[in-house]
Interface confidence: low
């Protein structure tokens, strides 16, 4: 008799794929055209990335460091009108893209939370949550919560308002902290909070270090849903050398939780390559004309247009991973088991019941390595086969779809492999 199928977990929309942050509308759209109407025209691009949610803004009125001139219910006229926002929401809904609004109050100022007037600000946030929930947003983000006194209790209250309106609404909190204890204390008092932090921001050194960070985090948070990113707002290139971007894309899309990216991560957007551009929000490179300041500074392969035309580009990899992440049960909500594969490597299995299983092997080092995949670390339910089919490599040159012998696996420097194999009773 066939074994009984495992009961599927309840899946919220943010469990099904990546979130995409557009913190600076003007930088995202470029050419001084950064407004909500223009963003509406970019929704097809977001659809092509198969992201599930757009984290937008802040876009509310905020006069730097002035509480009285900060209105979380009003859209800054530079970004457009409430009608523009409603129109964006409707268009996004049609394309199955959820919209999360960033309500970090003093986003133009020194302290995001006007440290001397916490209660006033907290009331403003509470009012704003109710207002924007009625307007149809799918969730909220608040950043820099390390600057918010009594953050845990405020987050609990805001979470209650958000979930009270609908279980289908999401609250994201962001912190610059990379300290696991601080992160856990924020999560403890807020059951369904999605927290972005700098926890993984210094993980780029070795496979062992990354493995230990990831497994510590997952062990500490138990079975609660988490998010994966390298920071609450910044680009991957702020933390990673170019040669690790593909590896991190593969990892972030295949760890258990919601991957969260900033605009430009999908093309390896790097402020350092664009003289005069701010590190936190460089101009998005749609094509070679997006950065006219220095002729020739932008080549086609740095842009959305150039990379869209190249099946081997970082953008193409992002799209493929995003697609896999959103449709494979084992990647959507499968169990996770990390295991030893040798120095410099981080490897793990994702599996769900009798569905196709996935093996991820990541070489963080700058030398080629042979992977000694020791299944001794793995429970019987997640045992490794002798061979697995190569779904994709972060580096070109391998024949996709071909079976690879796991005992003889060799990885190029900075190469990541995503392999698939069937469930075997």
């Amino acid at each position: 008799r066939a074994p009984r199928c495992r009961e599927l977990p309840a899946q919220k929309w943010w469990h099904t794929g990546a979130l995409y942050r557009i913190g600076d509308l003007q930088a995202f759209q470029g050419h001084g055209a950064g407004n909500l109407a223009g963003l509406k025209g970019r929704l097809d691009y977001l659809s092509s990335l198969k992201v599930k949610g757009l984290v937008l803004g802040p876009i509310h009125k905020n006069q730097k460091d002035d509480v009285a001139q900060t209105d979380l219910l009003q859209i800054d006229p530079n970004f457009g009108s409430k009608e523009d926002f409603d129109s964006l929401l409707q268009s996004a809904k049609k394309k199955s893209i959820r919209v999360i609004l960033d309500l970090t109050p003093n986003y133009r100022g020194e302290n995001s939370w006007f440290s001397t007037q916490v209660d006033t600000v907290a009331t403003k946030v509470k009012d704003a949550l109710e207002f924007w929930l009625q307007a149809g947003v799918d969730g909220f983000q608040v950043r820099d919560i390390e600057n918010l006194k009594d953050a845990s209790s405020f987050l609990a209250e805001w979470q209650n308002i958000t979930k009270g309106f609908s279980e289908d609404r999401l609250l994201i909190a962001g912190t610059n902290s990379s300290d696991l204890q601080q992160i856990l204390s924020l999560l403890e008092s807020n059951k369904d909070l999605l927290l972005t932090s700098s926890y993984l921001s210094d993980s780029g050194s070795t496979g062992e270090h990354t493995k230990s960070l990831v497994t510590q985090y997952l062990n500490a948070t138990g079975n609660r849903w988490c998010s994966w990113s390298l920071s609450q707002a910044r680009l991957l290139t702020s933390f990673l050398p170019a040669q690790l971007l593909r590896l991190y894309q593969l990892m972030l899309f295949t760890l258990p939780g919601t991957p969260v990216f900033s605009y430009g991560d999908e093309i390896g957007l790097d402020a350092a390559a664009l003289p005069g551009q701010p590190m936190e929000a460089p101009v998005m490179l749609w094509d070679e004309s997006s950065f006219p300041d220095i002729p020739g500074a932008v080549s086609a392969n740095m842009t959305v247009k150039g990379q869209s035309e190249d099946p081997g580009s970082l953008l193409s990899l992002f799209r493929r991973l995003s697609d896999q992440r959103s449709k494979e049960r084992s990647l959507l909500h499968g169990d996770f088991h990390a295991f030893s594969a040798g120095p410099g490597l981080f490897s793990y299995i994702r599996h769900w019941d009798q569905n196709e299983r996935f093996l991820v092997v990541l070489n963080f080092g700058d030398v080629g390595l042979s992977a000694g995949l020791q299944a001794s670390d793995l429970p019987a339910s997640a045992s490794l086969p002798a061979k697995a089919d190569l779904l994709l490599s972060t580096q070109p040159g391998r024949e996709e779809g071909s079976p690879l012998e796991l005992e003889r696996l060799k990885l190029e420097p900075h190469e990541g492999l995503l392999l698939r194999f069937p469930y075997a009773a």
Epitope: A273, S299, G306, E309, D310, P311, S313, E400
Partner: antibody, heavy 118, light 107 residues
């Protein structure tokens, strides 16, 4: 192993049409773009353009717009170059070469010689 | 379009000799440069990509380097199979462009 195998040499008259094929093996053709490169006798290499093997969309260099057409038969893992209304100056060896950004033109076909003569 | 100026256009050298070929880019190409070898029978093989990364299977006597907008291919000790034409290729932007080539002949 990865190979690009091109069709054999062609002798044509001016005004005729030629179609050169390039069969890819050892990898999935849709994962890499395909470039075409011209080399006139005794001369250097000249990029003609490329075809996005995932979408089928061709891009032509300025000097190769009009009489030149790239096509694709994905099921046969084959890319093709067709030259219409042949001229004497089309006499050359034509190469196919696969492409991804950081690994552009890492594998090449052996070349197909096209001679146009009346 | 980005021009690649390759020099010298030809050189004669003896077996075991060290030779260097240069390629200068007319605009910034950020290291997006490859070196190709074309044998007398017409077959083309890529030797180096990203300015200095050796393709797998390419002998270690070949090396690539960059200094500003000048890119070099060095063969540390010429062997008989190295006598061929060498081209540089930029893939920083479209259209892709090649250098004019360097013919390496036996002295």
């Amino acid at each position: 192993q990865i190979q690009l195998v091109q069709s054999g040499p062609e002798l044509k008259k001016p005004g005729e049409t030629v179609k050169i094929s390039c069969k890819a093996s050892g990898y999935s053709i849709t994962n890499f773009g395909m470039n075409w490169v011209k080399q006139a006798p005794g001369k250097g290499l000249k990029w003609m353009g490329w075809v996005n093997t995932y979408t089928g969309e061709p891009t032509y260099a300025d000097d190769f717009k009009g009489r030149f057409a790239f096509s694709l038969e994905t099921s046969a893992s084959t890319a093709s170059l067709q030259i219409n209304n042949l001229k004497n100056e089309d006499t050359a060896t034509y190469f196919c070469t696969r492409s991804v950004i950081t690994y552009t033109m890492d594998y090449w076909g052996q070349g197909t010689s096209v001679t146009v003569s009346s | 379009d980005i021009q690649l100026t390759q020099s010298p256009s030809s050189l004669s050298a003896s077996l075991g000799e060290r030779v260097s070929l240069t390629c200068r880019a007319s605009q910034e190409i950020s290291g997006y440069l490859s070196w190709l070898q074309q044998k007398p029978d017409g077959t083309i093989k890529r030797l180096i990509y990203a300015a200095s990364t050796l393709d797998s299977g390419v002998p270690k006597r070949f090396s690539g380097s960059r200094s500003g907008s000048d890119y070099s291919l060095t063969i540390s000790s010429l062997e008989s199979e190295d006598f061929a034409d060498y081209y540089c290729l930029q893939y920083a932007s479209y259209p892709r462009t090649f250098g004019g080539g360097t013919k390496v002949e036996i002295k």
